[in-house]
């Protein structure tokens, strides 16, 4: 099931920024999702549940995000122009067991500015 998650559109563009979507199986209840830019952790989101099923979300790097029952989307508004970067979603599954760590989708994002117009953004899987 995890292997199927790479086949989705990882990057989309809006409001001059980049949305990076990291998908995971709907059965996952508690998780950590990390977004790597090259080898650097850019975003780190953890979702856990307590004994009363209350959800706790920790976002220590303060990345703008959107969480659904099968994806985490991170929003980047300061992507460097004229410089390509490789982005990778890394998933740790706490629940249900067994504990698993998986590198999910990855893609190369190149942003460059046209002298005539606007930023053009290309991504390669």
């Amino acid at each position: 099931e995890l292997n199927d998650l790479a086949n989705h559109r990882m990057f989309s563009f809006h409001d001059g920024g980049v949305q990076i979507s990291c998908n995971y199986p709907e059965t996952v209840q508690q998780l950590k999702m990390q977004l790597f830019k090259d080898r650097e952790v850019l975003c780190d989101l953890t979702k856990t549940k307590g004994s009363g099923n209350t959800v706790s979300i920790k976002n220590p790097m303060s990345c703008p995000y959107q969480l659904s029952n099968n994806s985490v989307s991170f929003f980047l508004d300061n992507a460097d122009s004229s410089q390509g970067s490789y982005f990778l979603c890394s998933l740790s599954i706490f629940d249900p067991p067994p504990f698993q760590e998986k590198n999910l989708s990855g893609g190369y994002l190149l942003i460059y500015e046209s002298q005539l117009c606007c930023q053009l953004k290309l991504w390669l899987p």
Epitope: T27, Q30, N53, D95
Partner: antibody, heavy 117, light 111 residues
Framework: EVQLVESGGGLVQPGGSLRLSCAAS????????MDWVRQAPGKGLVWVSN????????EYSPFVKGRFTISRDNAKNTLYLQMNSLRAEDTAVYYC??????????WGQGTLVTVSS | DIVMTQSPDSLAVSLGERATINCKSS??????????LTWYQQKPGQPPKLLIF???TRHTGVPDRFSGSGSGTDFTLTISSLQAEDVAVYYC?????????FGPGTKVDIK
């Protein structure tokens, strides 16, 4: 090896206060929700309170809400339970427990709190 | 609050025989594909120990003579072949919502 060691129990008069502590070791304390569960002598288990990984979420049993306060110090790997306005019915062994994502997977040996005049 | 009930209150079973404990919740504990029900064993003078989570998954190190079953509001803990070291009180517990609650316990003895 996960270890949870409670302290701070004892005899207290009705209306009095006590502060329980739980020293945790053998795991990354700041990665886990933690709970207090109590057991009156010869009786069953009753959940008391919980706290999330950094202390920003706390929940309480209706029996203790407004009287007990749970807190944690992740730098000291310690969980606390401040108990005020104690009543005779609060007499119990208080267990510190780790919420291991889908169950209480580690328990301390417990500390006895006796509320009596 | 969800109320958990257990039956019987106590039972005595011969060594090697099957012991069955029932647990009922006042509302369904099923959410998605998960039943938010756990079982604990408490031996005399000891803290409780996690046996089964999500109604049917054995915790690490728990012998396979222990099994859990059921869904929704009705659950069962079965000890397929009772051993002397299984003498204990067994509690069911839900974590479907707050506050989580325990059943009153079932005491298991040797006949």
């Amino acid at each position: 090896e996960v270890q949870l060691v409670e302290s701070g129990g004892g005899l207290v008069q009705p209306g009095g206060s006590l502060r329980l502590s739980c020293a945790a070791s053998g795991f990354t304390f700041s990665d886990y929700w933690m709970d207090w569960v109590r057991q009156a002598p010869g009786k069953g288990l009753v959940w008391v309170s919980n706290i999330d990984e950094d202390g920003s979420i706390t929940e309480y049993s209706p029996f203790v809400k407004g009287r007990f306060t749970i807190s944690r110090d992740n730098a000291k790997n310690t969980l606390y339970l401040q108990m005020n306005s104690l009543r005779a019915e609060d007499t119990a062994v208080y267990y510190c427990t780790r919420w291991g994502r889908f169950g209480f997977d580690s328990w301390g040996q417990g500390t006895l709190v006796t509320v009596s005049s | 609050d969800i109320v958990m009930t257990q039956s019987p209150d106590s039972l005595a079973v011969s060594l090697g025989e099957r012991a069955t404990i029932n647990c009922k919740s006042s509302q369904s504990l099923l959410s998605g594909s998960f039943n938010y029900l756990t079982w604990y064993q408490q031996k005399p003078g000891q803290p409780p120990k996690l046996l089964i989570f999500y109604a049917s998954t054995r915790h690490t190190g728990v012998p396979d003579r222990f099994s859990g079953s059921g869904s929704g509001t009705d659950f069962t803990l079965t000890i397929s072949s009772l051993q002397a070291e299984d003498v204990a009180v067994y509690y069911c517990h839900h974590h479907y919502n707050a506050p989580p609650t325990f059943g009153p316990g079932t005491k298991v003895d040797i006949k």
